[in-house]
């Protein structure tokens, strides 16, 4: 809790690490040869910049931010990544017909910087 001390984006609205949704077809995802349904997925992903202390996941992310300011060529800024996921079930093709399979790390639920 101590690390996640910044939810105000200094770069302006919508520019910092956030959840973003893109509608994608099975063809877009390259899944058409093994997934039958759903034909379209509302893919939620994490995008945006991670400026100083914004949604820092932990102390390591805070340290990374500080060192990036000092040595930008050596230490990269924290990255915007999923903090948790929403599970999703797919109907897949199998040798014998179709089956269900659930994936617990397919869709981002919320985001942080790490």
């Amino acid at each position: 809790a101590r690390a996640r001390n910044g939810d105000h984006c200094p770069l302006g609205p919508g520019r910092c690490c956030r959840l973003h949704t893109v509608r994608a077809s099975l063809e877009d995802l390259g899944w058409a040869d093994w997934v039958l349904r759903p034909r379209e997925v509302q893919v939620t992903m994490c995008i945006g910049a991670c400026p100083s202390q914004f949604r820092a996941a932990n102390m390591h992310a805070q340290i990374k931010t500080s060192l990036h300011r000092l040595k930008p060529d050596t230490v990269p800024a924290p990255c915007c990544v999923p903090a948790s996921y929403n599970p999703m079930v797919l109907i897949q093709k199998t040798d014998t017909g179709v089956s269900l399979q659930t994936y617990d790390d397919l869709l981002a639920k919320d985001c942080h910087c790490i």
């Epitope: 349904r37 759903p38 034909r39 999703m88 079930v89 179709v98 659930t102 639920k109």
Partner: antibody, heavy 119, light 110 residues
Framework: EVQLVQSGAEVKKPGESLKISCKGS????????IGWVRQMPGKGLEWMGV????????IYSPSFQGQVTISADKSISTAYLQWSSLKASDTAMYYC????????????WGQGTLVTVSS | QSVLTQPPSVSGAPGQRVTISCSGS????????VNWYQQLPGTAPKLLIY???NRPSGVPDRFSGSKSGTSASLAITGLQAEDEADYYC??????????FGGGTKLTVLG
Amino acid sequence: EVQLVQSGAEVKKPGESLKISCKGSGYSFTSYWIGWVRQMPGKGLEWMGVIDPSGSYTIYSPSFQGQVTISADKSISTAYLQWSSLKASDTAMYYCARYGRYGTYFDYWGQGTLVTVSS
Amino acid sequence: QSVLTQPPSVSGAPGQRVTISCSGSSSNIGVLYVNWYQQLPGTAPKLLIYSNDNRPSGVPDRFSGSKSGTSASLAITGLQAEDEADYYCQSWDSSSNYVFGGGTKLTVLG
């Protein structure tokens, strides 16, 4: 308003066939999967199978594979559960339920159809 | 025998907090999600909690879900007479797809 309306209660004899229905309204019927769940008298919930109405793909629980048939008619937004030869042990309440957005939970349920099989 | 294990019954007085457990294994709850349903007497089940800890709109915040390891729990605070019902957990299992717990009957005392 999302609604799943099931057909009425049925009383049948062993060996008879039966087809019960579940009509969806208030949403795009082909955009959500429909599942069937059995509840025997005084017992818990058992997942029977699922159908994707847009392509009529069906997957059954191993416990119900070959015992029942799940189908759908997207032109009238209706899913079906049928038996070719009922047994006394099929006596139960049967619920249809719509799957939520990610296919992991049931967000809307029908009111249930009570099927009684007795000689 | 259900893949997910719940206590057959729990009880509490109005205003109290009760919890209902749901125990699974590494092939279901351990790696995946848990949903909870409420079934009032003589009615169809209703979604109460999805993906471990999310409440659908219209469900009071007195109901909350959590998951730890291969177990999950449903907590109900400020117990009310109308909470008397059967509660079911549900998850996914690689061998049988969607699985339910055996159900827990909640009795509100007094």
